[in-house]
Structures are given as structure tokens and as C-alpha cells.
């Protein structure tokens, strides 16, 4: 808490400059008054404050403003804003994508902090959804932004929203998020024809079922092998080895390489052996030729 | 986290110069270039001298054309070059500078004396 003194004379502050970096912290909370400080807000960043005099100026925003700052101040908050606690930002209302961009440039280039957190949480509740340009700038700033979403929040994601999303944003995403993101990329990328589709779909498939597996195996996609490998294997089991090699196509030959590894692995086990032998690979586990394969998956499903 | 080391303070009879010099253990990330501080007894931390990143200077009304900050790049420190010295100089003079995530930092500070 800052000592009250008297502004000595002389000092009063007449307008936000740079003359205010060579005030002790008490002459600030003396001589510079909350409203001037407010309207003038917008100089503040410019001039070479300490945080200890930020934390000075910050309390006489407070004072002047206990239910929360206005978005006038908000905006030009600039370094000031990382004195801010959560509390304080819970207190107000951003409805504007300027604003949010100028404090989450005082962030840039590090990880997201608690207070910006809360602030993307009040921007977006108040928008009611993530739109397209709220998530292209946020993307922008945070790439693993979408992934930090909860299932529930990702809900309220517009399908055209999903135009922002970059290959990256997807990078730390868990399969019960691409589950939510998967429908509304195909929704959104629905009327592009089918190599540019699945240019598009290509990061989402982690979220995709079997159905929509086979479908993409009758169009010549060539899906790699780091995508196959981040596929459902739920979504991978009932494909057939001739819709897994339609599938890959050139790339079927990477199967050899992560037969270890899920979803090959389980894949492999479900397969006839004679047909994994047709593709030439090597590959071992396959059920032996003369087994009966029981879906006991199938039988609990109809008793 | 970079250190801050001050140095040359001392005991100067009025109208005496002192030379500080204030060393960084590697290279500052600062968003306010490099200031030199003093703090009396029973007073508050005031800034003395400013050099911004662009090599700007500033300085207090109290010590315009007395004091001179400077940098050496090379050696990774920052000067202050104290002439005409009066006895309301003495403090504990700090070098400081604040980071691009909310902190200030500050060395040990270094003891001037102007006394006869």
C-alpha cells in the first residue's frame, strides 16, 4: 500500500508524460489524479514506467474504478495489464477484437499466463461463440489455443469458424477433442471437391469414424503415415486391408515400420493373415489362415 | 534470470565525481532500457538516469547536467558518470531494469557518500 502524502508543490500532474518516471511512488499517488490518468491512458505505454510505478497506477484505476474498468481504459492498458490479477479481469466486459488483440500482444512470444486465459474466457463468453475472426486471432497468437479447449467449449465453435484452423492448432489435440472437431470440419469443407477435401479434413481426422475411413479409401488420397497413426483405432479395426492400402496408397509400405505401434498393431491383429500377406510387407499377427473370427463386440450388442 | 552488479560507489567530499558502473551477467531483455536508481534513508527508490534501448537518455531535474549515463555494449554495462556532487546525492544507488513479463530487477546497490 502506498504511503498518502500531501503532492508536494509543483508536482501535481497536468498530463500523463514522461516527466512521471522520476516521481517517488508516493509522489504518483499524490500528484497524478485517477481521472486525468484514465483519459490519458493511451501515453502510458509509451513511457518507461517501472512495474512498481505500473503498480501504483494500477491502484488508482482501481480506486476509481471498483466494479471494473471501462473499455476505453482496457484498451490501452498495454504493459500494465500484466499487473493484473484474474480477479480484476473477471470484473470486465470486452466485447471488442482491438482490445483483446492489444493485450495479447503484452503476452506475445510467451505462454499463455493465467490473466490472458481469463480474458479470452470473458471475450468469448461474452461473444457467445468462438467466430471466425475471435479464433483466427487467438490461433495467431496461441497455436495450441483450440487444444486447451474442453470438449464442452468446443461446441460453441461455428462450423465456418473452422476455415482458421491450421494443421499446428491441432497439434496437441486429444482424440475426445478432434471427436467434436471432426463433424464441423466436415460440415465446413463439405462442398470442396475431393483432393483439395482432404487437404482440408487431413488434421481433423482423428475425430473420424469408419464409415467416412472407407469413403476416403475409395478417392486416391495417399494419407500418410503420421495421419494413419493419429487415426481412431476404433475408426481403424474394421477397415479391410484392401481399404487400408486404397487408403495409403504409396504409403502402405510405412506399415511395416510401426507394426509395434497402435493403431497398427490392433489392426494387424484383426486381419486374416493371408491378406496381410498379399501386401508383401511382412507384416505378422494376422489371425492364421482356417481360424473363425468371432465379433464378440457384435454378440453382447444383440443378447 | 540475468544479475545485476554495481560498483565504483564510495566517500567523495562535495564537488567530487564518482564513476558507477553497473555489470549484467548476459544479455537483458528490458522494455525500458537500463535506469540507475537511489534510495536514501527513510525515502522512497527514485530514478536517477534512463538509457533507453535506442540509446535515449533521461534524466532527473536534480542531476540534469551533473550526471551522465552511458553504455558499453561490449562489456555488457551500463555507467553512471557523477560530476559536481552535492551532499543530497548521497544513497544507495541501484541499477535496475524491467523485463517483458511484469518484473523489476534490481542489483545489491552501491553506497555514495558526498560529505566533507
Known amino acids: 500500500e502506498v504511503e498518502k502524502t500531501a503532492c508536494p508543490s509543483g508536482k501535481k500532474a497536468r498530463e500523463i508524460d514522461e516527466s512521471l518516471i522520476f516521481y517517488k511512488k508516493w509522489e504518483l499517488e499524490a500528484c497524478v489524479d485517477a481521472a486525468l490518468l484514465a483519459t490519458q491512458m493511451d501515453r502510458v505505454n509509451a513511457i518507461p514506467f517501472t512495474y512498481e510505478q505500473l503498480d501504483v497506477l494500477k491502484h488508482k484505476l482501481d480506486e476509481l474504478y471498483p466494479q471494473g474498468y471501462p473499455e476505453s481504459v482496457i484498451q490501452h492498458l498495454g504493459y500494465l495489464f500484466l499487473k493484473m490479477s484474474p480477479e480484476d479481469i473477471r470484473k470486465w466486459n470486452v466485447t471488442s477484437l482491438e482490445t483483446l488483440k492489444a493485450l495479447l500482444e503484452v503476452n506475445k512470444g510467451h505462454e499463455m499466463s493465467p490473466q490472458v486465459a481469463t480474458l479470452i474466457d470473458r471475450f468469448v463468453k461474452g461473444r457467445g461463440q468462438l467466430d471466425k475472426d475471435t479464433l483466427d486471432t487467438l490461433t495467431a497468437f496461441y497455436p495450441g489455443y483450440l487444444c486447451s479447449l474442453s470438449p464442452e467449449e468446443l461446441s460453441s465453435v461455428p462450423p465456418s469458424s473452422i476455415w482458421a484452423v491450421r494443421p499446428q492448432d491441432l497439434d496437441t489435440c486429444d482424440p475426445r477433442q478432434l471427436d467434436v472437431l471432426y463433424p464441423k470440419a466436415r460440415l465446413a469443407f463439405q462442398n470442396m471437391n475431393g483432393s483439395e477435401y482432404f487437404v482440408k479434413i487431413q488434421s481433423f481426422l482423428g475425430g473420424a469414424p469408419t464409415e467416412d475411413l472407407k469413403a476416403l479409401s475409395q478417392q486416391n488420397v495417399s494419407m500418410d503415415l503420421a495421419t494413419f497413426m493419429k487415426l481412431r483405432t476404433d475408426a481403424v479395426l474394421p477397415l479391410t486391408v484392401a481399404e487400408v492400402q486404397k487408403l495409403l496408397g504409396p504409403h502402405v509400405e510405412g506399415l511395416k515400420a510401426e507394426e509395434r505401434h497402435r493403431p497398427v498393431r490392433d489392426w494387424i491383429l484383426r486381419q486374416r493373415q493371408d491378406d496381410l500377406d498379399t501386401l508383401g510387407l511382412g507384416l505378422q499377427g494376422g489371425i492364421p489362415n482356417g481360424y473363425l473370427v468371432l465379433d464378440l463386440s457384435m454378440q453382447e450388442a444383440l443378447s | 534470470q540475468v544479475q545485476l552488479q554495481e560498483s565504483g560507489g564510495g566517500l567523495v567530499q562535495p564537488g567530487g565525481s564518482l564513476r558507477l558502473s553497473c555489470a549484467t551477467s548476459?544479455?537483458?531483455?528490458?522494455?525500458?532500457?537500463m535506469g540507475w536508481f537511489r534510495q536514501a534513508p527513510g525515502e522512497q527508490r527514485e530514478l536517477v538516469a534512463r538509457?533507453?534501448?535506442?540509446?535515449?537518455?533521461m534524466y532527473a531535474d536534480s542531476v540534469k547536467g551533473r550526471f551522465t549515463i552511458s553504455r558499453d555494449n561490449a562489456k555488457n554495462t551500463v555507467l553512471l558518470q557523477m560530476n559536481s556532487l552535492k551532499p543530497e546525492d548521497t544513497a544507495v544507488y541501484y541499477c535496475?531494469?524491467?523485463?517483458?513479463?511484469?518484473?523489476?530487477?534490481w542489483g545489491q546497490g552501491t553506497q555514495v557518500t558526498v560529505s566533507s
Open positions: 548476459g544479455t537483458i531483455f528490458s522494455r525500458n532500457g
Open positions: 538509457i533507453l534501448n535506442d540509446g535515449t537518455t
Open positions: 535496475g531494469y524491467s523485463d517483458y513479463r511484469g518484473t523489476d530487477y
